[in-house]
């Protein structure tokens, strides 16, 4: 008789990241008997939901069910049927929904209610949909990358699992850039965290971590662009905005009503003598950089030192993983290599922004124009945020590692969120048998 393979004793988990610009579904898998070991959970699937972020379904929540169908059906296919009922599903909404809730709690609640109802229709163990705080978003991103880098493991390895991994147990800081917010999270060196709102204490695998985190709402790349436009149109002499953050020859008409739709531009709102204006790109990195810096208020700091807008930031310490839009933008610009210095990045950005729009469109024919047009702004914004916002220098730039995936799992808050909610990161170091790591080391 033929030998039958024993059924794989594995578990699955699903997390939906409901971001400001889109929703992504992640499926994670791990060996059931090694739940408490570090580094055993890995991502087996990412499904990007077609369409915008869930906050855009305001007043048309009836469309949410259809919106989620494809990716939820994909999860049904990937996860064995016998596991469906035991597979937890979590949805976390981030800054897009935080902004919606600021404007209307009722609208935000309606969206979440319908999301919950839609997800409850699937055969999985739905655990709820909620808007996570900026602090959680930062913390879970930090947990994710350090878990995947093996930083919580007490066993030192003689080999490195990723090119930028150092063999010490110093954790990496986490830099996350979304469409509507950005997070900075790291363990400062023997530094008191002066503002309690920015302090987190963790005990993970028997070790204590005092972590600094802050989420800057409205400073994700999309909302930062709206802020910049709202600021710059204030001083425009007519309905033409000559914008250094767009390529020469680029033109786009913007509705003033769209500009002022987001709470992020409220501080710049004024009555304008026109209902539309035209962006005309002039493609000048230096001027774009200067314009972006005006979004950061560095004149006021009630602490020993600040990032911007009066927010405490301790001195930077150690290596940082920069992920999400930090990675996607820099990857597009071909600037993720460890060997590229900050000066070189700046040089390349100057050249890129100065390229005529027609030339850019030809060079990147496969890229949607909406996204393509914003890479000059986004790249410049990343440099401005990291250098002037977070005080990285030309020297400390080499400590920033632009990370898309680690060990096949996306860097981001979703894995950390699931690990926490499924209690898979113990406070104490689990007692392991001599062979407990043998199957995956």
């Amino acid at each position: 008789t033929q030998n039958k393979a024993l059924p794989e004793n594995v578990k699955y988990g699903i997390v939906l990241d409901a971001g400001s610009s889109h929703t992504s579904l992640y499926i994670y898998k791990w060996p059931a008997e090694k739940e408490n070991d570090t580094g055993v959970v890995h991502q087996v699937e990412e499904c990007r939901v077609k369409g915008p972020g869930i906050s855009k379904f305001v007043q048309k929540v009836n469309e949410i069910g259809i919106y989620l169908t494809d990716c939820m059906e994909r999860a049904r296919e990937v996860i064995p049927r016998s596991q469906h009922q035991e597979t937890p599903v979590y949805l976390g909404a981030t800054a897009g929904m935080r902004l919606l809730r600021m404007e209307s709690e009722e609208l935000a609640d309606r969206v979440l209610d319908v999301v919950e109802r839609s997800l409850s229709n699937y055969p999985f163990d739905f655990q709820g949909a909620r808007i996570i705080t900026g602090q959680e978003e930062g913390a879970y991103g930090w947990i994710t990358i350090n878990y995947l880098l093996g930083k919580f493991s007490q066993k030192t390895r003689w080999f490195s699992i990723v090119p930028y991994e150092t063999n010490n147990q110093e954790t990496f800081g986490a830099l996350d850039l979304g469409g509507a917010s950005t997070q900075v999270t790291f363990v400062p060196q023997n530094q008191t965290i002066e503002s309690p709102d920015n302090a987190l204490q963790f005990r993970l695998y028997g070790k204590d971590y005092n972590v600094y985190t802050h989420s800057f709402l409205c400073y994700g790349k999309d909302q930062a662009l709206w802020q910049k436009l709202a600021k710059d149109i204030q001083v425009a002499s007519n309905e033409i905005l000559r914008d250094p953050c767009f390529h020469p020859g680029y033109k786009k008409v913007v509705n003033v009503s769209d500009l002022y739709k987001t709470p992020c531009t409220k501080r710049f709102e004024m009555t304008l003598p026109f209902q539309q204006f035209e962006i005309q790109g002039i493609g000048n990195y230096q001027q774009c950089h200067q314009s972006i810096l005006e979004l950061f208020n560095t004149s006021y700091c009630p602490y020993s030192q600040c990032a911007f807008n009066g927010i405490f930031l301790p001195p930077l310490q150690g290596d940082f993983g920069a992920f999400s839009a930090f990675y996607f933008v820099m990857k597009f610009l071909n600037l993720t290599s460890e060997k590229v210095s900050q000066e070189k990045v700046t040089e390349m950005m100057k050249k890129f922004c100065a390229q005529p729009w027609e030339e850019i469109k030809t060079s990147y024919a496969g890229v949607k124009e909406k996204y393509l047009s914003e890479y000059c702004f986004s790249g410049t914004y990343i440099l401005s945020l990291l250098l002037q916002g977070y005080h990285f220098t030309a020297d400390s730039w080499e400590h920033i590692h632009f990370i898309g995936k680690i060990q096949g799992s996306d860097a981001g808050w979703t894995l950390g969120y699931m690990l926490n909610l499924t209690n898979m990161i113990p406070a104490e170091q689990p007692l392991s048998t001599p062979l407990s790591h043998s199957t995956y080391v």
Partner: antibody
């Protein structure tokens, strides 16, 4: 109490433009979309489309694409319907109707209606 | 487009009667049907939503039923103030469409 108050009757010539207002009170304007409905004399109701009062995004029924425009003045809790290049067949009463929210399974219904604005197009 | 057919254009009734107005959808609309009452010179008023849910303040003599393609509005004890046009409406998919209307008249 909740009210939708529309602007008064209009007498227009073919080719002209008319702009009808619908002022909402008694509720949070951005929490509910606004529908527009046409009723020609002695005829039934025809849905023209709706505007998302939170995002400002309009949705038009096929028969009302082109000459018709929905807009908002959120600070004044007011929705507008503009009809350009008026034709005789635009003679009708136009209603604004709130897109009320009623939860699962169908979510929406037109729960509050304006009193209607009569538009007469005649040369 | 989904066509909503109200086959009876007019219905003659008497006070105290039980009146049933029917509406047929050209395709399945689930329970996404509303009923409106319109009196001469007035705007429509919502009576029933989601096929069978009575709107706030609507007298309980008005009842909605049906799902899929066949829907009924029933007035169990006809009153003189119920003389009006009645429209069904589907909002299962765009464009939203109304029935042609049924006018209730006194015999």
């Amino acid at each position: 109490q909740i009210q939708l108050v529309q602007s008064g009757p209009e007498l227009k010539k073919p080719g002209e433009t008319v702009k009808i207002s619908c002022e909402a009170s008694g509720y949070t304007f951005i929490n509910y979309g606004m529908n527009w409905v046409k009723q020609a004399p002695g005829k039934g109701l025809k849905w023209m489309g709706w505007i998302n009062t939170y995002t400002g995004e309009p949705t038009y029924a096929d028969d009302f694409k082109g000459r018709f425009a929905f807009s908002l003045e959120t600070s004044a809790n007011t929705a507008y319907l503009q009809i350009n290049n008026l034709k005789n067949e635009d003679t009708a009463t136009y209603f604004c109707a709130r897109k009320g929210y009623y939860g699962y399974p169908n979510y929406y219904a037109m729960d509050y209606w304006g009193q209607g604005t009569s538009v007469t197009v005649s040369s | 487009d989904i066509v909503m057919t109200q086959s009876q254009k007019f219905m003659s009734t008497s006070v105290g009667d039980r009146v049933s107005i029917t509406c047929k959808a050209s395709q399945n609309v689930g329970t996404a049907v509303a009923w409106y009452q319109q009196k001469p010179g007035q705007s429509p008023k919502l009576l029933i939503y989601s096929a069978s849910n009575r709107y706030t303040g609507v007298p309980d003599r008005f009842t909605g039923s049906g799902s899929g393609t066949d829907f009924t509005l029933t007035i169990s004890n006809m009153q003189s103030e119920d003389l009006a046009d009645y429209f069904c409406q589907q909002y299962s998919s765009y464009p939203i469409t109304f029935g042609t209307g049924t006018k209730l008249e006194i015999k």
